[in-house]
Interface confidence: medium
């Protein structure tokens, strides 16, 4: 078993011990900018300079894989069968980002029951699932691996998933393939997925400096957590929960509950572009509210 594969989400190879098992993973225990975190609305800082996020809208093809740790969609290239020549990369920019990032992969985290599953939480509330869209800084680094342990290397866009009757259409494209990746190592082709189409209908987000949420816990990720969920149906969650970590002859345990517990925020700021007041009573644009006595709070939809 290689080191990359040799860790789990519980027990003596679980998150509490990641940084102790392998010296190269020491940041998992010693790091002070670790992810995920619990987002406390009261602690959010409004930043008037934050712009909307931009993700290219064109579709891309790739592979969806059961890695034994997670469900991952990876952007393909012209070497993978079924591609119509070279793909145009999907770029991620704007928001808090100073560089242009190139989409690399999507990770899916989910629970074996509806109360847990997301890695990020809001005021202690965890969602049944979370999708994380990762890109690497293509202006400074040649590929995702190079960027992983380098300054400003990675962007992670977090989309929280709430239970609903009607699912996001692009999410359906991914979950429709789950039957074909029941076991660890299985992969299936996904054609023409819109990364932008996965996003909820909001420009509002929270952002902080953090890490990857699996070993080696590199502290090189700018996290952008979108302020609205997208929806996943019970049937889709059920399909996710049927996935296994191992092979058909040794299926091991279900793949779910693949979330790292929240990490200490310590003194990191969490900035947001959610403003309270954008117009004055006379209809003219107001200056952004920077009042210290104004606080954020979680909305009631989180209980629904």
């Amino acid at each position: 078993v290689s080191w990359e594969d040799w860790w789990t989400y519980d027990g003596i190879s679980g998150p509490a011990f990641w940084g102790l098992i392998n010296p190269e993973w020491s940041l998992c225990n010693k790091g002070r900018r670790q992810s995920p975190v619990n987002l406390e609305p009261q602690r959010l800082l409004f930043d008037p300079n934050l712009r909307p996020m931009h993700i290219d809208k064109h579709r891309i093809s790739g592979l969806i894989t059961n890695t034994g740790h997670s469900v991952i969609f990876t952007a393909g290239n012209d070497t993978v069968a079924n591609y119509d020549g070279m793909q145009t990369p999907v770029n991620i920019s704007g928001g808090p980002l100073s560089y242009r990032y190139r989409f690399h992969e999507i990770h899916m985290h989910y629970g074996l029951n509806d109360q847990f599953g997301s890695e990020h939480s809001v005021e202690g509330y965890t969602f049944p699932a979370e999708i994380q869209i990762f890109g690497y800084n293509s202006q400074l680094y040649a590929n995702f691996s190079d960027a992983l342990n380098r300054a400003q290397g990675i962007v992670g866009v977090s989309i929280l998933l709430q239970l609903g009757d009607l699912s996001n259409a692009e999410l359906r494209m991914l979950t429709d393939q789950l039957e074909r990746i029941r076991y660890g190592g299985d992969e299936a082709f996904v054609k023409r997925l819109s990364i932008r189409g996965l996003l909820p209908d909001t420009d509002h987000y929270m952002t902080y400096d953090g890490s990857t949420t699996a070993p080696a816990c590199h502290e090189t990720v700018t996290w952008v957590v979108l302020n609205k969920p997208i929806y996943i149906t019970k049937q889709q969650l059920h399909a996710l929960r049927r996935l296994m970590q191992g092979s058909p002859d040794h299926p091991k345990a279900p793949l779910g509950n693949n979330y790292r517990p929240p990490q200490p925020l310590l003194h990191r700021p969490i900035r947001t572009n959610i403003d309270f007041k954008t117009t004055k009573s006379n209809g003219k644009a107001a200056c952004p509210t920077m009042y210290r006595e104004v606080y954020y709070k979680a909305t009631s939809w989180k209980q629904n």
């Epitope: 003596i12 190879s13 011990f17």
Partner: nanobody, 118 residues
Amino acid sequence: QVQLQESGGGLVQAGGSLRLSCAASGTISYAPVMGWYRQAPGKEREFVAGISLGGNTNYADSVKGRFTISRDNAKNTVYLQMNSLKPEDTAVYYCAAVYVGSSPYEYWGQGTQVTVSS
């Protein structure tokens, strides 16, 4: 080849205590993490507690405040002190250890039966 041997299991009344021991045939100085799991009849094996070489500990929610894990590297032994036992703690308890070489490996003991009667 490392062998792990559990002892200390038995029958105990609810509210009572037991101390499990796990002796390793080789040095545990190369085992960055050791721990205890348990398996009740008809259920999946579940994590109980773990301890690192430096003494960092982690517990399953169901045993927090009642069970304490410790290790004695000189004696190549890891212990599980179980207090305020409940009938639902009845299971076979297994010792496990992570050993690190060029690649990591998990070793397991044969298990010791713990029965808590009400």
